[in-house]
Interface confidence: low
């Protein structure tokens, strides 16, 4: 019978400000009151399914009841008016949703941009969250003409793209209106010429041309965006080598007006460079374009800029009157080779005698020389020309090397193995550093590097491993030949030994025992052995620990008990920790030698 509601709630669709007060009234219809035999006293108010305490109700008259909320904190409140009918059954009369939120704040930071070829877009800061549907409208006008409103879309409420084409050199006034159910506010107006808001398209068709005459330059050309007919452009040109991650920039003052080419100077020969370019209005008013697509080019070759590192090794087993000498050199890095290396030229001149020439593709040359003094030179050649020569004196067989470096030290730092020394008083032409891994299982295979004569500290430029003992040799090289080599051992990073020492008895007496052990093989040391600890105990006694210097290979335990089983083990320690060796047992005799019961 009662298809239409039993009553209604006023107001029907309330929108209220957060933390404000609100009153709703439920009015019952006469036919409903008659049907259910109820009046306003029977009304039960509920929010979100929960009954509101009666103390919040006011009975206005027999048909109407009100409820008041103070400090509304919920964004959405489902409010229902219900009546208690016969048998305390609840009957829903009407329901509403109270929506709460905040009025809009004044929009701030209004700014506009004209992307070349597109219409003007403006954006702003809409202020705090209102929790309500809030509409933003961008308004714009000339002094003589009003443009159509731009209504921001729901998914992008703080920006809008206008519907009209941009006209340059005429000022436009722009502002934003924000409106919701609780109020309406307007931003500050901004007035500008759209030409000062332009973001040009990036320059395109960027290309790079090299020069055979100059190996240090590359010429860039590009096509400017169409906006060049409206504004004067300035540019940023950036470049980097192909493998670099950071960009260098041409000084902006060199590219401060419209152009379509530029020559980049002071580049490295035979190097691939990557370029990009962007542009904007020359007075800096507006926006930089996006970067152009990248373009790359390779500078022309130049002759090698440096002589290679050059050294020699003499085979110790030499035939009467002759010796086998291996000349060795290092490949130049690309930034010194300045092109594709074709070959190496070696000359050997016996002291004040004839000259021998060799053209070599490898980085070593083995020759048989007499016991005389020789002068060796080495040049490297590419398409453009030859490097300066590296010169090496190979002294006569009876040469006595002197003047070593002093205070040689080696130490790890920042994951590198550093070597330093005090320079000799004599004038050193260069230093040769050689290093190899000491091992009981394999020969010491040497790597090497060359340093200028002015250097007294450097790091080893090889692939070094942790926990390996490196034998490092530094040889000063003088005009008349090499000086005395000095050597030192070092670790890139130490670790505890892989094995501990194996202890045994050398001699056992009634009250003492002489223990002995072998030095640990270098392959298991993993670092410098700093000290040993001997641990010994009886089956029932506490363990005793004795520290022993790492130079020792035997130790005497004294004050032992006769006729007693002892357990002994030994640990070796590097700077990074220790490792125990196997446990060994021995028994002291009941009587000393010659002693009877």
């Amino acid at each position: 019978e009662l298809l239409d509601p039993c009553g209604y709630i006023s107001p029907e669709s309330p929108v209220v400000q957060l933390h404000s007060n609100f009153t709703a009234v439920c009015v019952l219809k006469e036919k409903c009151m008659d049907y259910f035999h109820v009046n306003a006293n029977y009304i039960v108010w509920k929010t979100n399914h929960f009954t509101i305490p009666k103390e919040q109700y006011t009975i206005i008259n027999r048909t109407a009841s009100s409820v008041t909320f103070t400090d509304i904190a919920s964004l959405n409140i489902q409010l229902t008016c219900n009546i208690l009918t016969f048998g305390q059954l609840e009957q829903n009369v009407y329901g509403i949703t109270i929506i709460s939120g905040l009025p809009p704040e004044k929009p701030k930071n209004l700014s506009c941009i004209v992307n070349e070829g597109k219409k003007m877009r403006c954006e702003w800061d809409g202020g705090r969250e209102t929790h309500l549907e809030t509409n933003f409208t961008l308004k714009s006008e000339w002094a003589t003409h009003k443009f159509a409103d731009c209504k921001a879309k729901r998914d992008t409420p703080t920006s809008c793209t206008v519907d009209y084409s941009t006209v340059y050199f005429v000022n436009i006034e722009v502002w934003v209106e924000a409106e919701n159910a609780l109020g309406k506010v307007t931003s500050d107006h901004i007035n500008f010429d759209p030409v000062y808001k332009v973001k040009p398209n990036p320059p395109h068709n960027l290309s790079v041309i090299n020069s055979e005459e100059l190996s240090s330059i590359l010429k860039l050309t590009w096509t400017n965006p169409s906006i060049k007919s409206v504004i004067i452009l300035k540019y940023n040109i950036q470049y980097r080598t192909k493998d670099a991650s950071t960009w260098s920039q041409i000084p902006p003052e060199d590219t401060a007006s419209t152009r379509s080419s530029f020559t980049v100077q002071d580049l490295k020969p035979f190097t691939e460079y990557v370029f990009r370019i962007r542009c904007m209005k020359e007075d800096g008013k507006g926006y930089w374009s996006d970067w152009s697509e990248e373009a790359s080019g390779i500078t022309y070759e130049d002759r090698p800029s440096k002589a290679p590192s050059f050294w020699y090794k003499i085979d110790p087993s030499h035939t009467q009157g002759y010796r086998t000498v291996q000349l060795v050199w290092k490949t130049l890095p690309p930034f010194e080779a300045n092109g594709k290396i074709l070959d190496y030229e070696v000359t050997l001149t016996r002291w004040k005698s004839h000259l021998q020439n060799y053209t070599v593709n490898a980085t070593k040359l083995t020759v048989n020389l007499t016991n005389d003094r020789y002068l060796a030179t080495l040049t490297v050649r590419n398409l453009v020309g030859k490097s300066d020569a590296a010169v090496l004196t190979i002294p006569a067989c009876d040469f006595q090397a002197t003047h070593p470096v002093m205070d040689l030290k080696a130490f790890p730092k920042d994951n590198m193995l550093w070597v330093e020394w005090t320079t000799p008083r004599e004038s050193v032409k260069k230093y040769i550093l050689e290093w190899c891994v000491l091992s009981d299982k394999a020969p010491c295979i040497t790597d090497w590097q060359q340093e200028d004569g002015t250097v007294h500290r450097t790091y080893l430029r090889g692939n070094l491993a942790e926990s390996k003992c490196y034998l490092i040799t530094v040889t000063p090289v003088y005009a008349d030949g090499p000086g005395s080599p000095e050597s030192i051992k070092a670790y890139l990073k130490q670790a505890p030994p892989s094995k501990g020492p194996t202890v045994r008895t050398k001699k056992v007496g009634k009250n003492e025992a002489v223990l002995e052990w072998d030095q640990l093989p270098v392959d298991v040391q993993n670092g410098f052995i700093r000290n040993y600890t001997i641990f010994y105990r009886t089956i029932i006694g506490n363990e005793t620990a004795v520290n022993v210097d790492s130079s020792h290979t035997e130790y005497t335990l004294s004050s032992l008990t006769s006729d007693t089983l002892y357990m002994v083990r030994m640990a070796a320690y590097t700077d990074e920790g220790g490792k125990d060796g196997p446990e060994f047992t021995f028994t002291t005799p009941k009587f000393a030698q010659g002693e009877i019961e």
Epitope: K46, N48, H49, T51, A73, L75, N76, Q78, E90
Partner: antibody, heavy 120, light 108 residues
Framework: QLQLQESGPGLVKPSETLSLICTVS??????????WGWIRQPPGKGLEWIGN???????YYNPSLKSRVTISVDTSKNQFSLKLSFVTAADTAVYHC????????????WGQGTMVTVSS | DIQMTQSPSSLSASVGDRVTITCRAS??????LNWYQQKPGKAPKLLIY???SLQSGVPSRFSGSGSGTDFTLTISSLQPEDFATYYC??????????FGQGTRLEIK
């Protein structure tokens, strides 16, 4: 994401007061759209609603337990608590705290529950 | 108080079966009805709210229907992880919030 964790003694003597705390993490207990509730489940039986609390402090209790129940909130610690006085063996149950979504009218997130035994 | 009655109180079914559980309210509760799933030793988990709305993250094989006094929970194709106890709950006339006595769903 939001999580609830019940804590409190597992054994309470008859006639004493059962006290439990529910700690809310990953969200604010003062949130506008949620109530916070306690539900219990005696061993092998169904679910019984104890009461709900709104972040502002207003409470709603099951009339069958109303005289013995107090639910309160400590917003600074993001916790709400249950006190049930004059307990008997019939109050032995797993006690769950849960979040009541006022828009859906349902307990949408639950704590894993804590077993409370009433025994001397 | 509004009483909620579930039927059956227990039922056996096989993986792949279509299963229906019903819940009846002692008076009209409009569509203020929720369904929960509870596995042994775990907390209940909300499946359906407002009679037919699927809770986020719940598989679509679960569905709810009904309004007034009669409601159903349907599992369209039973999966091994669905064997549990299911509870209905009304939120129309509160306090108190009331639950059904539960329906235990077992493997046949």
């Amino acid at each position: 994401q939001l999580q609830l964790q019940e804590s409190g003694p597992g054994l309470v003597k008859p006639s004493e007061t059962l006290s439990l705390i529910c700690t809310v993490s990953g969200g604010s207990i003062s949130s506008n759209n949620y109530y916070w509730g306690w539900i219990r489940q005696p061993p092998g039986k169904g679910l019984e609603w104890i009461g709900n609390l709104y972040g502002s402090g207003s409470t709603y209790y099951n009339p069958s337990l109303k005289s013995r129940v107090t639910i309160s909130v400590d917003t600074s610690k993001n916790q709400f608590s249950l006190k049930l006085s004059f307990v008997t063996a019939a109050d032995t149950a797993v006690y769950h705290c849960a979040r009541w979504d006022t828009n859906g009218g349902a307990f949408d997130i639950w704590g894993q529950g804590t077993m409370v035994t009433v025994s001397s | 108080d509004i009483q909620m009655t579930q039927s059956p109180s227990s039922l056996s079914a096989s993986v792949g079966d279509r299963v229906t559980i019903t819940c009846r309210a002692s008076q009209s509760i409009s569509s203020y009805l929720n369904w929960y799933q509870q596995k042994p030793g775990k907390a209940p988990k909300l499946l359906i709210y407002a009679a037919s709305s699927l809770q986020s993250g719940v598989p679509s094989r679960f569905s709810g229907s009904g309004s007034g006094t009669d409601f159903t929970l349907t599992i369209s194709s039973l999966q091994p992880e669905d064997f549990a106890t299911y509870y209905c709950q009304q939120s129309y006339s509160t306090p108190p919030i009331t639950f059904g006595q539960g329906t235990r769903l077992e493997i046949k």
